[in-house]
Interface confidence: low
């Protein structure tokens, strides 16, 4: 499942913690808590509730270490608790780190602990009334993140912001091309594609195929943006990044990373009117490449779409639908190139890995 950030995370929140869920709960919202239970823990609580007063709790999730360990789930309406649902297992260990993930679905909450399914809890009250998360008890939290699952892949490609099909040269200069044509976006391998998008209505994403999503006026991506590339790169794998260059931009960069190395560094520099490409291995940069087929394709204050296609011998880069350059692989272990980083003076609107 692809995810995009629904709101800024809460970092190291002090317990007891109560904080707003921006926009309330919506189908597809995933709330993840990472923390550590205290070594003397007896119980802790995560509440999804309406407002800060605690009288209306849509989902009360309450692990209890006593009596062998179990978890209580319940709902409180108008100050009254309903019948408890008890799961007679304890997925948490005292004094140990954990990752607790709540996924809001149409009819229930799904709860994962340390990436394993633990329990589901049927909605007893409309989940869209929930606008607050509250955490208390014997634990310490590192963060609470909020992410929305992205659009179904089959509907996504009609929304890419290319004004025309991407134009790439048929054959690289001086080389025979192994693959004659670029696979167009709608034929990209589905199973490997992750879309990170910003939508105005996460609960109803792409109900009408072909209508582009409305982008929030404020950036929902944090910059620098990091995301894994599932299974790394391989020939025909494509990556698409769309965004807006800030009006006072100096530079930004797109890095395809291989551990601590940067296999491909794409670095538009507005103060130099150049697009620098390079590779960093063992913290050392190689020879820069700056040649362009045409003019500098990025402009301050303008939107852009960058499409990077990984081929067997090179990366091909298109900007706003036009081929910009090729970059021959210097790091050949493509499957180990598994992280995308985008940083600099831009606002991101779409990322597809």
């Amino acid at each position: 499942m692809a995810l995009f950030s629904a709101q800024s995370p809460y970092i190291n929140p002090i317990i007891p913690f109560t904080g707003p869920i921006q926009g309330g709960l919506q189908e597809g919202l995933q709330v993840t808590l990472q923390g550590t239970t205290k070594s003397f823990a007896q119980r802790f609580v995560v509440n999804f509730q309406n407002s800060f007063n605690g009288n209306d709790i849509a989902f009360h999730f309450n692990p209890r270490f006593e009596e062998g360990g179990y978890v209580v789930c319940n709902t409180k309406q108008n100050g009254q608790w309903g019948p408890e649902e008890r799961k007679m297992q304890m997925p948490f260990q005292k004094g140990m780190p954990f990752e607790l993930c709540f996924l809001v679905q149409r009819s229930e909450f799904k709860v994962m602990v340390n990436k394993k399914f633990f329990v589901q809890y049927q909605h007893r009250v409309p989940y869209h009334l929930v606008d607050t998360i509250a955490v208390s008890g014997c634990l310490k939290l590192s963060f609470i993140t909020f992410q929305n699952s992205a659009a179904p892949v089959q509907h996504v490609f009609s929304t890419l912001q290319f004004s025309q099909p991407v134009q790439f040269p048929r054959t690289p200069k001086g080389r025979k091309q192994k693959t004659q044509n670029f696979r167009p976006a709608h034929q990209a391998p589905m199973a490997q594609t992750t879309i990170h998008m910003v939508h105005s209505t996460p609960g109803q994403m792409f109900s009408t195929p072909g209508i582009p999503p409305v982008v929030y006026p404020t950036p929902a991506y944090t910059i620098p943006f990091y995301t894994p590339i599932p299974n790394g790169l391989y020939p025909s794998k494509s990556i698409m990044i769309s965004g807006n260059v800030l009006p006072d931009a100096t530079r930004f960069h797109i890095n395809l990373r291989c551990g601590g190395d940067i296999a491909f560094h794409l670095n538009p520099r507005f103060n130099e009117n150049a697009v620098v490409r390079n590779t960093q291995i063992n913290n050392s940069w190689g020879q820069e490449e700056r040649s362009l087929l045409g003019r500098m394709p990025f402009s301050r204050g303008q939107s852009f779409s960058v499409w990077i296609i990984c081929e067997g011998h090179c990366f091909k880069v298109a900007v706003n639908g036009q081929h910009m350059c090729e970059y021959y692989h210097r790091l050949k272990n493509l499957q180990d190139i598994n992280t995308l980083e985008v940083a600099g003076d831009i606002q991101l609107t779409h990322v597809q890995t």
Partner: antibody, heavy 123, light 107 residues
Framework: EVQLVESGGGLVQPGGSLRLSCAAS????????IHWVRQAPGKGLEWVAR????????YYADSVKGRFTISADTSKNTAYLQMNSLRAEDTAVYYC????????????????WGQGTLVTVSS | DIQMTQSPSSLSASVGDRVTITCRAS??????VAWYQQKPGKAPKLLIY???SLYSGVPSRFSGSRSGTDFTLTISSLQPEDFATYYC?????????FGQGTKVEIK
């Protein structure tokens, strides 16, 4: 409780070696980068090196490149700084710090630090 | 490397004063700037990240702002426990460089 505890500091002669350790507890080690930052007596902070404890990617400041090596042992939740060819100017308190990989804006924001360990390079 | 030029290097102020410390980056670092407080013999403590986001547990009298490549830490009403040295740090490009520090002393 999140804790970072440095050890291994001491007095060493110029050209000598020292290995610092940073024992981490109270958090998921592989979700963080571990950094070493040093502070010479009466001076400011200088970032030295960092390791991505999930992928073991490493970066170094130019001043230590080729002499220092950062590493990590996830089974022990411990990061190390192997310091070779030590010079007088490496004398400092060495701190380890963590930074969450998906921290908003940048994964190099240091939210927890150890208490520091003093390294003195002198003959 | 990106240089972070911090000013002033020291300042004297009284309890209740409004204190402003600035840092200028030698090139664009987006909003990837953090501010730390350090007291003698202690490790630094995070105050501000992302140029203007207040770190959890830090009093609201601390604030940060950005204007291009200029970054500002403001203490709206100085308290006795705020007398310390403050550092800015850019966390945009490795190496993650710090400013040279500003020592806030009692007038």
């Amino acid at each position: 409780e999140v804790q970072l505890v440095e050890s291994g500091g001491g007095l060493v002669q110029p050209g000598g070696s020292l290995r610092l350790s940073c024992a981490a507890s109270g958090f998921t080690f592989h979700s963080y980068w571990i950094h070493w930052v040093r502070q010479a007596p009466g001076k400011g902070l200088e970032w030295v090196a960092r390791i991505d404890s999930s992928k073991f990617g490493t970066y170094y400041a130019d001043s230590v490149k080729g002499r220092f090596t950062i590493s990590a042992d996830t089974s022990k939740n411990t990061a190390y700084l192997q310091m070779n060819s030590l010079r007088a100017e490496d004398t400092a308190v060495y701190y380890c710090a963590r930074s969450y990989i998906d921290y908003p804006v940048s994964p190099a924001v240091f939210d927890y630090w150890g208490q520091g360990t003093l390294v003195t390079v002198s003959s | 490397d990106i240089q972070m030029t911090q000013s002033p290097s020291s300042l004297s102020a009284s309890v209740g004063d409004r204190v402003t410390i600035t840092c200028r980056a030698s090139q664009s670092v987006s909003s990837a700037v953090a501010w730390y407080q350090q007291k003698p013999g202690k490790a630094p403590k995070l105050l501000i990240y992302s140029a203007s986001s207040l770190y959890s547990g830090v009093p609201s009298r601390f604030s940060g702002s950005r204007s291009g490549t200029d970054f500002t830490l403001t203490i709206s009403s100085l308290q006795p426990e705020d007398f310390a040295t403050y550092y800015c740090q850019q966390v945009y490009f490795s190496p993650y460089t710090f400013g040279q520090g500003t020592k806030v002393e009692i007038k």
